[in-house]
């Protein structure tokens, strides 16, 4: 029997699990107060690598520590449109087979739709989450995870795959988005920035977080991942933002402490099994959900994205280790491995909690909430 994760579960890393309401609903600016670029450029619009700064141009700035207390959206910059210095980039030199269009990288050539036409689809990921516009869906119940607390043996494969660091998960990690929506976890990986430059894939009101974890799941309706590509609900990803906190996160340290061993592209090591759920926020009941795509080629659509409202806290040193240890192809640092946010094109992001409720006396007019489209309402 699957049991939802309990609210009173101990926080990660001895009390640094993250803010309870990082994307806090109160005092949200109204639509008119937050101008932003509606249609950020796709990969094909990114500058070529010669237009992008190399590592030597990146300032060695420590990420600023968030102030104590709940992070509110009004504390966040409302405009951080793609095209600014935090635009995703890959400092890689071109592969030896430079004219080969069958692979991809962050920024520059080849344009992703040339690698996979699906990358030009209308319902792509990641997206900018605007809690004010999310549809509250009471039918979205707490996520259920079973078998995520792994014993030390057998060990797991931690690999620098040239695009991210990937932890391959063994059979038996079950996740349910709701009744009859059951999945098996396949792998987890991270997205990050560079020194002083955030690198989450999803954004909230234009705010980009330091990093983001993705746990990729396959629907139990499919035996193999390639069979599920492009099938609605065939794949599901749990995503959480990583932020800077005052303490070391002991769960993440089990992985981060091993990154030096896999600094080279294509290298791997074995790590003892760990509690995978400890890498996620403790609150499994508050999240945003929408249908999108893989964030790398082949960019297949039909992927169910669940983005936690609560963040996970890592120390400044840990975030620096994440962004400054690994190397990609061509003797380039593996950094800024995130895709630009993609237009919603009419999609409505759903929330398992009333994220759009504006209790602020500043609101001149009532907030227009989107209606919930979740099945079972």
């Amino acid at each position: 029997q699957r049991l939802p994760r309990m609210q009173e579960d101990s926080p990660l890393g001895g009390g640094s699990s993250g803010e309870d309401d990082p994307l806090g609903e109160e005092d949200l600016p109204s639509e008119e107060d937050s101008p932003r670029e509606e249609d950020p450029p796709g990969e094909e619009d990114l500058p070529g690598e010669e237009d992008l700064p190399g590592e030597e141009d990146l300032p060695e700035v420590k990420p600023k520590s968030e102030e104590e207390g709940s992070l509110k959206l009004e504390d966040l910059p409302t405009v951080e449109a793609p095209g600014d210095p935090q635009e995703p980039q890959n400092n890689a030199h071109r592969d030896k087979e430079g004219d080969d269009q069958s692979h991809w990288r962050y920024g520059g050539d080849p344009p992703w739709p040339r690698v996979s036409p699906a990358c030009a689809g209308r319902f792509q990921s990641p997206v900018d989450i605007r809690p004010q516009l999310a549809a509250f869906c009471p039918a979205l119940r707490p996520l259920e995870l079973l078998g995520f607390q792994l014993p030390p043996l057998p060990e797991l494969r931690l690999r620098n795959n040239g695009h991210s660091v990937q932890l391959t998960l063994p059979p038996g990690l079950e996740m349910a988005l709701g009744p009859g929506r059951e999945y098996r976890a396949l792998q987890l990986h991270l997205h990050w920035g560079a020194a002083g430059r955030p690198g989450s894939e999803h954004t909230v009101e234009g705010h980009r977080f330091p990093a983001e974890i993705h746990v990729v799941h396959l629907s139990t309706a499919f035996a193999r991942v390639d069979e599920a590509l492009g099938r609605p609900g065939g794949l599901a990803v749990l995503a959480a933002f990583l932020e800077e906190g005052p303490e070391e996160n002991s769960a993440y340290e089990q992985l981060l402490s091993r990154l030096e061993e896999i600094a080279e592209e294509g290298s791997e090591t074995q790590v003892p099994g760990l509690d995978i759920s400890a890498l996620l926020p403790s609150d499994f009941s508050r999240y945003f959900q929408y249908e999108g795509s893989l964030t790398t080629p082949p960019c297949a659509q039909g992927v169910i994205w669940t983005v936690f409202n609560q963040t996970v806290m890592l120390s400044a040193k840990q975030l620096h280790t994440l962004s400054d240890t690994l190397w990609g192809p061509g003797d380039s640092r593996l950094q800024l491995n995130f895709r630009a946010t993609q237009p919603l094109n009419g999609r409505v992001i759903e929330a398992s909690f009333p994220a759009g409720v504006d209790s602020s006396p500043r609101a001149a007019e009532p907030v227009q909430l989107n209606s919930c489209l979740a099945a079972g309402d």
């Epitope: 890689a92 592969d95 030896k96 069958s102 692979h103 991809w104 690698v115 996979s116 690999r159 795959n161 040239g162 695009h163 991210s164 990937q166 391959t168 396949l186 792998q187 990986h189 993705h214 990729v216 396959l218 991942v225 390639d226 599920a228 590509l229 794949l235 990803v237 080279e264 592209e265 294509g266 893989l294 964030t295 790398t296 080629p297 082949p298 297949a300 192809p329 061509g330």
Partner: nanobody, 119 residues
Framework: QVQLVESGGGLVQPGGSLRLSCAAS????????MGWYRQAPGKQRELVAT???????NYADSVKGRFTISRDNSKNTLYLQMNSLRAEDTAVYYC?????????????WGQGTLVTVSS
């Protein structure tokens, strides 16, 4: 549907050479890493050599200087040139392809090709 077809195995005398090939087929494959692994009778499967998308190679100590891994990205084909073969190289050799499918690498394995080094 991904298919891996290995070829080139066979019987060879000590000191001889063989060249293994592995062709990957399927629609719109995005291949990240590729590699060769081997399993001798009664032993665990072990790494022989791997090559990344950008051409970075890694070899098991026991084959360094004797084996050369290479790949042709345009043909989705992997090769293993094996020189100065020894009796202890006798094993079933498996092709491994790490396909980039769902925001990460997913392993696919060939059926294996038998290499026997014997006089």
């Amino acid at each position: 549907q991904v298919q891996l077809v290995e070829s080139g195995g066979g019987l060879v005398q000590p000191g001889g050479s063989l060249r293994l090939s592995c062709a990957a087929s399927g629609s719109a494959l995005i291949i990240n890493a590729m590699g060769w692994y081997r399993q001798a009778p009664g032993k665990q499967r072990e790494l022989v050599a791997t090559v990344t998308r950008s051409g970075r190679t890694n070899y098991a100590d026991s084959v360094k200087g004797r084996f050369t891994i290479s790949r042709d990205n345009s043909k989705n084909t992997l090769y293993l040139q094996m020189n100065s073969l020894r009796a202890e190289d006798t094993a079933v050799y498996y092709c491994n392809v790490a396909l980039w499918i769902a925001d990460g690498e997913y392993d696919y394995w060939g059926q294996g090709t038998l290499v026997t080094v014997s006089s």
